[in-house]
Amino acid sequence: EEELQVIQPDKSVLVAAGETATLRCTATSLIPVGPIQWFRGAGPGRELIYNQKEGHFPRVTTVSDLTKRNNMDFSIRIGNITPADAGTYYCVKFRKGSPDDVEFKSGAGTELSVRAKPSAPVVSGPAARATPQHTVSFTCESHGFSPRDITLKWFKNGNELSDFQTNVDPVGESVSYSIHSTAKVVLTREDVHSQVICEVAHVTLQGDPLRGTANLSETIRVPPTLEVTQQPVRAENQVNVTCQVRKFYPQRLQLTWLENGNVSRTETASTVTENKDGTYNWMSWLLVNVSAHRDDVKLTCQVEHDGQPAVSKSHDLKVSAHPKEQGSNTAAENTGSNERNIY
């Protein structure tokens, strides 16, 4: 009679995490008498997965009834598969011996690969805000997937980005893998409403990629443009000067009026108007009593935006062009954009 062979017909088996793996094994003969054992790996470290004779293997069930005398099917099912179960599984026939059974013949092995979904991509931007024309880096991370092959793409407002670097770790074999990508994005003044999207495609996702997003409103700082203008004379001795603060983001802004270098008033932007592109405009007035000044007045609108160094715009008020009243009030009157002063 021909010598017993252990047949493992499947060179490899691919199973999704959480599912059951079936590892097939048949023997070509009933002789010699002795049990079958299943191992993961070979050599000194091989791990016992199932022993027909003894032991407790809660995740393993046999496909056929191994107690039947003429049984030659030693296939097993392993339940609730995780990426940690990946490896090469060997079906090994033992010959009954005394005191111990002796290994007789091994199957060729079945490589179990586990498909595991990647975690939802997490996109993070720079710690500090940056201004238009600057390049900022965004990172995207996703973990726990298997097999290793994965595709990652970056988009800004639906347009695919090309300036990025991606690493999949580890390089060698592993139960599961992680992906880390860094994309470079050039900011524009119109990016307050923009989004950066990281898209991950993997065999486990069946063509429905996972996406992570970051809003550029968290990253961008659009500095304001200032314009100081002198309004027509409101009363005989009063001049209304306005400071238009335009196209800034975020809203955090503090404005200080200086008269000849001396602080006149400080206020915080409150009632702002929003532009279509997400930036803000704001206006502040200063009502100057020109009769209080003998010489020309240098008015400065100084703006501190989002904790950055102050920017300013000045306007020279020609006092000589206005009649002076003797003994008039020497203090300048100031008002905000939504205040009214009655004299």
């Epitope: 191992f39 791990e47 074999e173």
Partner: antibody, heavy 117, light 108 residues
């Protein structure tokens, strides 16, 4: 938590015998390969012997025929019977759990064997 | 028998710097290479297996790379607790399993 505790080390004369034990806990002992790795004073690591989950045994050439590895799965204990000891066997002997992929994921603290006349 | 040669024997590095350790195998080990850390008076500790898979609880500053016969362990931003001896081990051929001679990482 996986724990491996070696015992049985000591000072012996060349040619004498010693038996080391390794008590294991925190995992299903019978399912895993176990190994002995030694380290001579001031030297590197040297694999000595291993016993697979099925009881198959493996030895380094330097100890083959002199050392015998065995295990008692009912007691969760690994043994190393060392006969015909030589001065060059002087080392700390570590018990280690072997993964299915043949590296060592857990180690005991070791037991010192000194062979000296 | 697969012979593993580690270099350098000793590496002097300042805390915060990067350490690069090399392990060369006498034949292809198919990526089956592990790294261990051993501090004085202590047992070895598994850091990395299969070239680059970090063991449970090992910080990300430890990374492994390489293929074929040449492998590298990189420690970025060395911390005081990282000064130790590092060993490589091939887990491709178990007859016998072999270790490299070790690299001592010491404070510069």
């Amino acid at each position: 938590d996986v724990q491996l505790v070696e015992s049985g080390g000591g000072v012996v004369r060349p040619g004498e015998s010693l038996r080391l034990s390794c008590a294991a806990s925190g995992f299903t002992f019978r399912n895993y390969g176990m190994s002995w790795v030694r380290q001579a004073p001031g030297e590197g690591l040297e694999w000595v012997s291993a016993s697979s989950g099925s009881g198959s045994t493996y030895y380094a050439d330097s100890v083959k025929g002199r050392f015998t590895i065995s295990r008692d799965n009912s007691k969760n204990t690994l043994y190393l019977q060392m006969n015909s000891l030589r001065a060059e066997d002087t080392a700390i002997y570590y018990c280690a759990k072997v993964t299915w992929n043949n590296f060592f994921d857990y180690w005991g603290l070791g037991t010192l064997v000194t062979v000296s006349s | 028998e697969i012979v593993l040669a580690q270099s350098p024997d000793t590496l002097s590095v300042s805390p915060g710097e990067r350490a690069t350790l090399t392990c060369r195998a006498s034949q292809d080990v198919a990526g089956k290479l592990a790294w261990y850390q051993q501090k004085p008076g202590q047992a070895p500790r598994l850091l990395i297996h299969a070239t680059s898979s970090r063991a449970d609880g090992i910080p990300a500053r430890f990374s492994g790379s390489g293929s074929g016969t040449e492998f590298t362990l990189t420690i970025t931003g060395l911390q005081s607790e990282d000064f130790a001896v590092y060993y490589c081990q091939q887990h491709y051929d178990w007859s016998p399993l072999t270790f490299g001679g070790g690299t001592k990482v010491e404070i510069k």
